[in-house]
């Protein structure tokens, strides 16, 4: 087949026609439509939105749009028995209680079904005891407490500030420290940018605002009751005691007004250094317990949430490819929100909606993409990436054979400063080339390319004249596609200036104040940043689905593999004596990386020269590119994390949001000096080097000439 048989317009005009059809005004309209009521996973409102999106995608012109439902474990507060935390006196009387809900934003006072702040999947319980302040509850914070300060958290209720790492890691760390309850709070140091008013007058977090969120440690398992398999009608479900990743101690989130009431009375040890102090007018004493006058008072948690198996609905739309219908490019983002979802997820869902509309418009004019494009509106992302994971589990055999790429589409904005991209190295060149063709929306960069403003504002730390592109971690719906299945993945959104804004995420994240007005008034009144993100996400999908040769450059993987090998080697070399004692060598890894580099270079040369009019050879070369990401998958997975199977990247064991390179080696080396059996520990390091070297070498060989 001729490469243009799929279309009645020239390839260059295709992309322009697609991008020109994207309109900021439509994104604005869709965002408004998606944010007027809450769309909590498992609720009737979110089911109705799924049906609305299904109907609209059909109208837009997709070939088919289906609902895929699953019955998964979700978590909800008890409507008649609210969750709260008390300060109790020596007689057990409650002298202070934390808030039961956030003050509703203006205009939303009469909206029903606003779920009060809660930590999803917290067990029930009413623990009482002394408080210990544990900073961000990171691994290093507990090391500081336990090893340096000799403070024992066993039997204590810990209070931790949100930020820096995924909340589930905080809870896991607290559990391992022996805590019997966890209070999470948003400190103004992390969620209140100086010089900006709090909502509704600005985009900062008010004192009554609270961040919701799940506290699971799923490690990629999906539904806690059906790990590895879809939660369908005939699923075998584990008992709750065997469920994956559930916390074992009660957890509850609060705002900074309530946190002030708890922290102002803290006694015990002073904070170890200034990095443990937030911005509240409290001493940030670590504890345990309250100071002198209040030493007989305790903290009591009242948690009554329930875990329930509930039906969720993904929307899956298909635009069939004309030439390679058995090759799938997927654009997916979630639909469920904690409350209104003004940013998370609907700023992303509105962009997906407009991308679908644009593709549909082209299709109605007679165009089709070369490859099949799948569009997904995922459910229950907020409860542990459940919708995407269950669908991928159900379709894993198809995906591992046919999946070309996955582009994620959660929140389009977390700021309005510059672009932020996390992706596989295979997509670096695609992203660079695309952003060079797009106009920058930034003030002061009129007439300049997006690439130029992005590079200026967010330069690569390694390569001058290039923008920063980060590793994929997790905490979003690309996880199953990339970390489990090895499908090349990427994500893009507009972000804040990380140099000047040190707060974590955006201040109103997962609060009731994440409204349409937040976006329209304060973040993107002209929706120009949303439009740019639509162009980046849509443009990536367009190129991946339509270019004759897949827009992957395997040489970029070679470059990062060398960088990651150097990094992990330098970490190991902090223990030169042990390396010598236990004969630890990285030679095999560096050798494999060298081989990969040479083979990738030769493959790229062949890619320039081969006969693109020969459909068999074209398909063969494209398959080598498509399957390269797959080649980094270890079927056995990482130690104790069977669903994290990518050998080059995994979510950090200390922060699900962050990506770690050579995670098997990294985890084997982590805190190795404290291991009781150094011989065994260094043996595991050697095993992980072996696994990594083998995997890199095996991946390299997939790029060799086939015969």
């Amino acid at each position: 087949k001729s490469s243009n048989e799929a279309t009645n317009i020239t390839p260059k005009h295709n992309m322009k026609a697609f991008l020109d059809e994207l309109k900021a005004e439509n994104i604005k309209k869709f965002l408004y439509n998606f944010t007027q009521i809450p769309h909590l996973a498992g609720t009737e409102q979110n089911f109705q939105l799924a049906k609305q999106i299904q109907s609209q995608w059909k109208e837009f012109g997709l070939d088919s749009v289906e609902l895929a439902h699953y019955d998964v474990l979700l978590s909800y507060p008890n409507k008649t028995h609210p969750n709260y935390i008390s300060i109790i006196n020596e007689d057990g009387n409650e002298i202070f209680n934390t808030s039961l809900f956030e003050p509703p934003p203006p205009g939303y006072e009469n909206v029903s079904d606003i779920v009060p702040p809660f930590s999803a999947f917290s067990p029930q319980g009413m623990p009482e005891g002394d408080l210990v302040y544990v900073n961000y509850a990171r691994t290093e914070d507990f090391f500081k407490l336990e090893r340096d300060m000799k403070i024992n958290c066993s039997g204590k209720i810990v209070i931790a500030r949100y930020g820096k790492v995924f909340r589930g890691n905080k809870v896991k760390n607290a559990q391992l420290a022996g805590a019997k309850g966890v209070i999470l709070y948003s400190d103004p140091a992390d969620y209140f940018a100086p010089g900006v008013k709090s909502y509704p007058d600005g985009w900062n977090l008010p004192g009554g605002g609270v961040q919701r969120g799940n506290i699971l440690n799923l490690n990629g398992a999906g539904d806690p009751l059906t790990p590895g398999y879809p939660a369908n009608e005939y699923a075998y479900r584990r008992g709750i005691a065997e469920a994956v990743g559930l916390p074992s101690i009660p957890v509850h989130p609060i705002g900074y007004y309530d946190a002030q009431k708890l922290l102002e009375k803290m006694g015990g040890s002073a904070p170890p250094d200034s990095s443990w102090r937030g911005s509240l007018k409290v001493p940030y004493n670590v504890g345990p317990g309250f100071t002198g006058n209040f030493s007989t008072q305790k903290v009591k948690m009242h948690i009554h949430s329930t875990n329930e198996v509930t039906r969720i609905y993904n929307v899956i739309g298909t635009l069939r490819g004309a030439v390679e219908p058995d090759r799938y490019v997927i654009l997916g983002g979630h639909r469920d929100s904690w409350v209104f979802g003004g940013i998370d997820p609907q700023s992303g869902a509105a962009v997906v909606h407009e991308i679908v509309r644009s593709f549909g418009t082209l299709k109605k004019e007679g165009w089709r993409p070369r490859r099949t494009i799948l569009f997904a509106s995922w459910d229950a992302e907020e409860f542990g990436l459940l919708g995407s994971t269950e669908w991928a589990e159900e379709n894993s055999r198809l995906l591992q054979e046919r999946g070309v790429a996955y582009i994620n589409a959660d929140s389009s904005i977390e700021g309005n400063y510059t672009l932020r991209v996390d992706c596989t190295p295979l997509m670096y060149s695609l992203v660079h080339n695309l952003t060079k063709e797009l106009k920058s929306p930034d003030e002061g960069f009129e007439g300049k390319s997006l690439y130029e403003s992005w590079t200026k504002k967010s330069p690569s730390p390694e390569f001058s004249g290039m923008p920063r592109i980060s590793k994929l971690g997790s905490g979003n719906d690309f996880e199953v596609f990339f970390q489990r299945l090895g499908i090349a993945s990427g994500r893009a959104r507009y972000t804040k200036n990380w140099e000047t804004n040190k707060f974590s995420g955006y201040p109103l994240y997962h609060s009731v104040y994440e409204t349409y007005e937040l976006v329209e008034k304060f973040y993107d009144p002209m929706f120009k940043y949303h439009l740019t993100v639509a162009q980046v996400r849509g443009g990536m999908v367009f190129e991946l689905a339509n270019s004759i040769v897949l827009p992957f450059d395997c040489r970029d993987y070679a470059v990062v593999l060398r960088k990651y090998a150097d990094k992990i080697y330098s970490i190991s070399m902090k223990h030169p004596q042990e390396m010598k004692t236990y004969s630890v060598s990285f030679d095999s890894l560096f050798s494999a990386v060298k081989n990969f580099t040479e083979i990738a270079s030769k493959f790229s040369e062949r890619l320039q020269d081969f006969d693109k009019s020969n459909p068999i050879v074209l398909r063969m070369m494209n398959d080598q590119l498509m399957f390269l990401e797959r080649a980094f998958i270890d079927p056995l997975g990482l130690p104790d994390r069977p669903f994290y199977r990518h050998v080059i990247y995994a979510p950090s064991s200390h922060n699900k949001y962050a990506g770690e390179s050579f995670p098997g080696i990294y985890d084997a080396l982590f805190d190795i000096e404290s291991k009781v059996d150094p011989s065994k520990a260094w043996g595991e390091v050697k095993r992980q080097i072996y696994v990594a070297a083998f995997t890199v070498q095996a991946a390299a060989e997939t790029l060799s000439e086939v015969a």
Epitope: P206, D258, Q260
Partner: antibody, heavy 124, light 110 residues
Framework: EVQLVESGGGVVQPGRSLRLSCAAS????????MHWVRQAPGKGLEWVAV????????YYADSVKGRFTISRDNSKNTLYLQMNSLRVEDTAVYYC?????????????????WGQGTTVTVSS | QSALTQPASVSGSPGQSITISCTGA?????????VSWYQQHPGKAPKLMIY???NRPSGVSNRFSGSKSGNTASLTISGLQAEDEADYYC??????????FGGGTKLTVL
């Protein structure tokens, strides 16, 4: 227009009960802490009780503790004061008042909106 | 919960400045910066004049100012005017999580 209107006052015998209401309008009632303050004839102001915006915290003056209950119905934009075991010394004009700060967990930032008051007379 | 101590009355001529004191204890006025001042004309509801010791709500004349020293808070009215004649009450947050008012001060403009 931001407004508080008290109702429910009247003449009642000692030992009996009365329920006062305060209807709020013109502002986001469900985001504000609310107070009851009273003023006996010819006397000064006496703070009676406060309730947080969500009803999670209620505090009372010693003189009414155990007899009076403050409550609110945010869906009706209404504040209540249930007064039981009334005494002659409870005779006063009862005002409801709004705490100044929206969304605050405190209730000590100053009362910036007041009703016109409703008169309660306890007499045998 | 004893009432805060205020002078029963103060007076001043138009244009003069007057100060009303409000004395409490370390468990209320001295311990917190949550002192408010209210003006009440006869037969009317009170009006907030000062909050958090020294802050003026919008719409309140800058002739009204507040301060605190130790366990005593003060309200100062400068450039006294006839319409300032009213009863003035202070209030403070207390250690027992309650509020307490002062006994009130009658201001007479001579």
């Amino acid at each position: 227009e931001v407004q508080l209107v008290e109702s429910g006052g009247g003449v009642v015998q000692p030992g009996r009960s009365l329920r006062l209401s305060c209807a709020a309008s013109g502002f986001s009632f469900s985001g504000y802490g609310m107070h009851w303050v009273r003023q006996a004839p010819g006397k000064g102001l006496e703070w009676v009780a406060v309730i947080s915006y969500d009803g999670s915290n209620k505090y009372y003056a010693d003189s009414v503790k155990g007899r009076f209950t403050i409550s609110r119905d945010n869906s009706k934009n209404t504040l209540y004061l249930q007064m039981n075991s009334l005494r002659v010394e409870d005779t006063a004009v009862y005002y409801c008042a709004r705490d100044r700060i929206w969304g605050s967990r405190g209730y000590y930032y100053g009362m910036d909106v007041w009703g016109q008051g409703t008169t309660v007379t306890v007499s045998s | 919960q004893s009432a805060l101590t205020q002078p029963a009355s103060v007076s001043g001529s138009p244009g003069q400045s007057i100060t009303i004191s409000c004395t409490g204890a370390s468990s209320d006025v001295g311990g917190y910066n949550y002192v408010s001042w209210y003006q009440q004309h006869p037969g009317k509801a009170p009006k907030l004049m000062i909050y958090e010791v020294s802050n003026r709500p919008s719409g309140v004349s800058n002739r009204f100012s507040g301060s605190k020293s130790g366990n005593t808070a003060s309200l100062t009215i400068s450039g006294l005017q006839a319409e300032d004649e009213a009863d003035y009450y202070c209030s403070s947050y207390t250690i027992t999580s309650t509020l307490v008012f002062g006994g009130g001060t009658k201001l007479t403009v001579l």
